[in-house]
């Protein structure tokens, strides 16, 4: 006992202030398992990471509290953090079956490029960033940008760094990234297109 609580606290303390705020807002609308109530909005929004951890555990108990936290983190695109939380809580625990994950509202928005619509999913799911970098190098990425992305330690952090350059790109530049994705992970593109 206590392992899941510590893992939840660990995850929440690693969120930026902006991410913690987003986490709380998502927690207000995330689908809950039957028989569980929602933490009141007023109390929720004023909590720090420690208070929120205690509240999650008291409302949802450790196992479901950790699972719910991981689901919200995943919904925020923080796949790696969600994975770490689940790994920490599953070590030696007889965790309850996974709850239903509601699909995100990802209907195509007019005027928004595919890579902007699906930014969070691409950050979470692209597994061969080097392929993309090689395809984009010299076309939309400078040597400095190329090296900056490669220097990141994980695929999600590499993708976040890559996305930090995209606000300056036009539609054609974004099409080059999409084309590279189609070549390296075509299932991912098809999967997101029909979501």
């Amino acid at each position: 006992m206590g392992r899941a609580r510590d893992a939840i606290l660990d995850a929440l303390e690693n969120l930026t202030a902006e991410e913690l705020k987003k986490f709380k807002l998502k927690l207000l609308s995330v689908p809950l398992r039957e028989g569980y109530g929602r933490i009141p909005r007023g109390a929720l929004l004023s909590m720090d990471a420690l208070d929120l951890t205690d509240k999650l555990v008291s409302f949802y108990l450790e196992t479901y509290g950790a699972e719910l936290t991981a689901n919200v983190l995943r919904d925020m695109g923080l796949q790696e953090m969600a994975g770490q939380l689940q790994a920490a809580t599953h070590q030696g625990s007889g965790a309850a079956p996974a709850g239903i994950q509601a699909p995100p509202q990802s209907a195509a928005k007019p005027g928004l490029h595919f890579i902007d619509q699906h930014r969070a999913a691409l950050i979470a799911r692209v597994t061969n960033v080097e392929w993309l970098l090689d395809a984009l190098y010299g076309k939309v990425l400078t040597d400095e940008q190329y090296q900056a992305v490669r220097a990141e330690p994980t695929n999600p952090s590499k993708m976040r760094k890559l996305f930090s350059f995209t606000p300056a790109w036009n539609w054609t530049c974004k099409d080059l990234l999409l084309q590279a994705l189609r070549e390296s992970q075509s299932y991912l593109v098809e999967d997101l297109e029909r979501s």
């Epitope: 699909p103 799911r125 597994t127 061969n128 999967d191």
Partner: antibody, heavy 122, light 106 residues
Framework: EVQLQESGPELVKPGSSVKISCKAS????????MNWVKQSHGKSLEWIGD????????VYNQKFKGKATLTVDKSSSTAYMELRSLTSEDSAVYFC???????????????WGQGTTLTVSS | DIVMTQSQKFMSTSVGDRVSLTCKAS??????VAWYQQKPGQSPKLLIY???IRYTGVPDRFTGSGSGTDFTLTISNMQSEDLADYFC????????FGAGTKLELK
């Protein structure tokens, strides 16, 4: 309790078609994509394709395009796979399998049906 | 398609052994790998996803590791009920499975 109940064994003639069903219970059907996997006798597993129960959007393994058609009936929480122009090569066990999550994670499968044995023989 | 190679078709083992099953991807798949156990006449059961995360209810003697192209499933204290076929699967692109490794008793 999540369950995927597949239809019974099929013995069919070469050149014909067959439609296998997979009835889901114990969860919200629309929340998880349904996948189909082929296992030939004593062999490994081959992914056929998957379907989004919300809009019927499906993705197929290139090898099974033209061979398999995936559909769903949301009202009965049932997924279907039709196989056509059957040959002895299609004799296998076919599993439906629920994709654990989607959008933020790729397709791996947390619940599987018991399998439907298809035998194609004249 | 990404090819998943499980070079050991069969592995002989004894109860209490530490067993390591390997799987190699033909291209980089990050950590998008799952492991399944299948017993005769049964459907596969999910053991590990994201290369190293143990699925709900799976005993902690099962451990997954690896990233990029090389992956390992380790059973730290082999039990008789672990005798089965084990398949790796990548889900970086269109899902593909390894050919499987059958664990047998020595």
């Amino acid at each position: 309790e999540v369950q995927l109940q597949e239809s019974g064994p099929e013995l069919v003639k070469p050149g014909s078609s067959v439609k296998i069903s997979c009835k889901a219970s114990g969860y919200t059907f629309a929340d998880h994509y349904m996948n189909w996997v082929k296992q030939s006798h004593g062999k490994s597993l081959e992914w056929i394709g998957d379907i989004n129960p919300n809009n019927g959007g499906s993705v197929y393994n290139q090898k099974f395009k033209g061979k398999a058609t995936l559909t769903v009936d949301k009202s009965s929480s049932t997924a279907y796979m039709e196989l056509r122009s059957l040959t002895s090569e299609d004799s296998a066990v076919y599993f439906c399998a629920r994709r654990r999550a989607h959008y933020y994670d790729g397709p791996y499968f947390d619940y599987w049906g018991q399998g439907t044995t298809l035998t194609v023989s004249s | 398609d990404i090819v998943m190679t499980q070079s050991q078709k069969f592995m002989s083992t004894s109860v209490g052994d530490r067993v390591s099953l390997t799987c190699k991807a033909s291209q980089i798949v990050g950590t998008a790998v799952a492991w399944y156990q299948q017993k005769p006449g049964q459907s596969p059961k999910l053991l590990i996803y994201s290369a190293s995360i143990r699925y709900t209810g799976v005993p902690d003697r099962f451990t997954g590791s690896g990233s990029g192209t090389d992956f390992t499933l380790t059973i730290s204290n082999m039990q008789s009920e672990d005798l089965a076929d084990y398949f790796c699967q990548q889900y970086s692109n269109y899902p593909t499975f390894g050919a499987g490794t059958k664990l047998e008793l020595k």
